[in-house]
Amino acid sequence: TQNKALPENVKYGIVLDAGSSHTSLYIYKWPAEKENDTGVVHQVEECRVKGPGISKFVQKVNEIGIYLTDCMERAREVIPRSQHQETPVYLGATAGMRLLRMESEELADRVLDVVERSLSNYPFDFQGARIITGQEEGAYGWITINYLLGKFSQKTRWFSIVPYETNNQETFGALDLGGASTQVTFVPQNQTIESPDNALQFRLYGKDYNVYTHSFLCYGKDQALWQKLAKDIQVASNEILRDPCFHPGYKKVVNVSDLYKTPCTKRFEMTLPFQQFEIQGIGNYQQCHQSILELFNTSYCPYSQCAFNGIFLPPLQGDFGAFSAFYFVMKFLNLTSEKVSQEKVTEMMKKFCAQPWEEIKTSYAGVKEKYLSEYCFSGTYILSLLLQGYHFTADSWEHIHFIGKIQGSDAGWTLGYMLNLTNMIPAEQPLSTPLSHSTYV
């Protein structure tokens, strides 16, 4: 008789990341009997929902169910039917919805209400949809990357199983860049965290962590651009804005109403003598960099040290994983290699931004123009944010690792969120049970 394989004793979890520009659904899988082990949960699927972020559905709220259908049906296919009822589903909304809530709590609630009703119709164990705080977004991103890097494991290994892993158990800091906010999270070296709002205390696998985190709302790459435009149009002499952050020859007409519809530009709002203006790219990295720096108020700091806008930031410590848009933008620009120095990155950005728009379109014919036009600004913004905003230097640049995935799982807040909500990160180190780990014979 043939040996029949025993049914896999596995569990699944689903997290939807409702970001400012789009929604992604992640499916995670882990062995049921190793729930409390570190590093056993891994991503088996990512499904990007077609369409914009949920905050854009205020005028079409009843379509949210349809919007989520394809990815939820994909989850139904990937996860065995016998597991559906015990598979938790979580949706976390980030800065796009934080901004909508600032404009109208009622509209934000209505969007979330429809999301909840839609997700409740599936055979999974729906656990709720909510707007997560910036502090949570930072913390869960930090948990995700350190969990995947094996930093919470108490077993020291003589070999490395994951990239960037050194034998020490020092955690990595987390740098997350979205469309509407950016987060910085790390364990400072023996430094008191001077502002309570930025302090987190964790006990994970028997070890205490004092973590610094801050989320800068309106400083994601998309909202930062709108801020910059709103700032620059104030001093424009007419409806032409010559912009160094776009390639020479690039032109784009912008509606003033679009510029002022986000709360992020409120501080720059003024009555303009025109309804539209035209951006004309001049492609100058240095001038673009200077313009971006004007978004960071560094003149005021009530602490021993600040990032910008009066926000406390301790001295940087250790290695950092930079993910989400930090990674996507730098990957496009071919600047994610560990060997590329900060000076080289700056040099490459200068060359890239100076390339004529027609030339860029030819070189990257397969890329949608709406995305292609953004990389000069986004790359320059990343450099400005990391160097002037967070005080990385040419020397400490080598401690930044641009990370897309670790061991096949996306770097981001979703895995940490699920690990926390399913109580899969114990406070104490679990006792090893016989044969729960592979043994050498």
Partner: nanobody, 124 residues
């Protein structure tokens, strides 16, 4: 931009059938879903049926079991097959398509396109 052209409306007796068509042209790669809405005199516009880019369908409770929505990708056309029609199905039927706005920039906006509408009258 996306252009939507509807056809197939008309007068039909109760219990009869009609098939509406909606042909899409333009930058359709960004479309996430297409569907049909209807508006009866003095009433609000309501969703009848929708089909996603992945082929999943969604029908209003009032039309389940009677109406079906389908699409032909080669013709970029969506169909609404309406059977067992009732007088209360009388309305102007509008084709709708929505998705990512390709002209939006630094943050994705929702694009929302509508056809001109086609009259469906169910009467004996």
């Amino acid at each position: 931009q996306v252009q939507l052209v509807e056809s197939g409306g008309g007068l039909v007796q109760p219990g009869g059938s009609l098939r509406l068509s909606c042909a899409a042209s333009g930058s359709i790669s960004s479309i996430a879903a297409m569907g049909w809405y209807r508006q009866a005199p003095g009433k609000e516009r309501e969703l009848v049926a929708a089909i996603t880019s992945g082929g999943n369908t969604n029908l209003a409770d009032s039309t389940k079991g009677r109406f079906t929505i389908s699409r032909d990708n080669t013709k970029n056309t969506v169909y609404l097959q309406m059977n067992s029609l009732k007088p209360e199905d009388t309305a102007v039927y509008y084709c709708n398509a929505w998705g990512e706005d390709d002209s939006s920039w630094f943050g994705t906006d929702l694009c929302d396109y509508w056809g001109q509408g086609t009259q469906v009258t169910v009467s004996s």
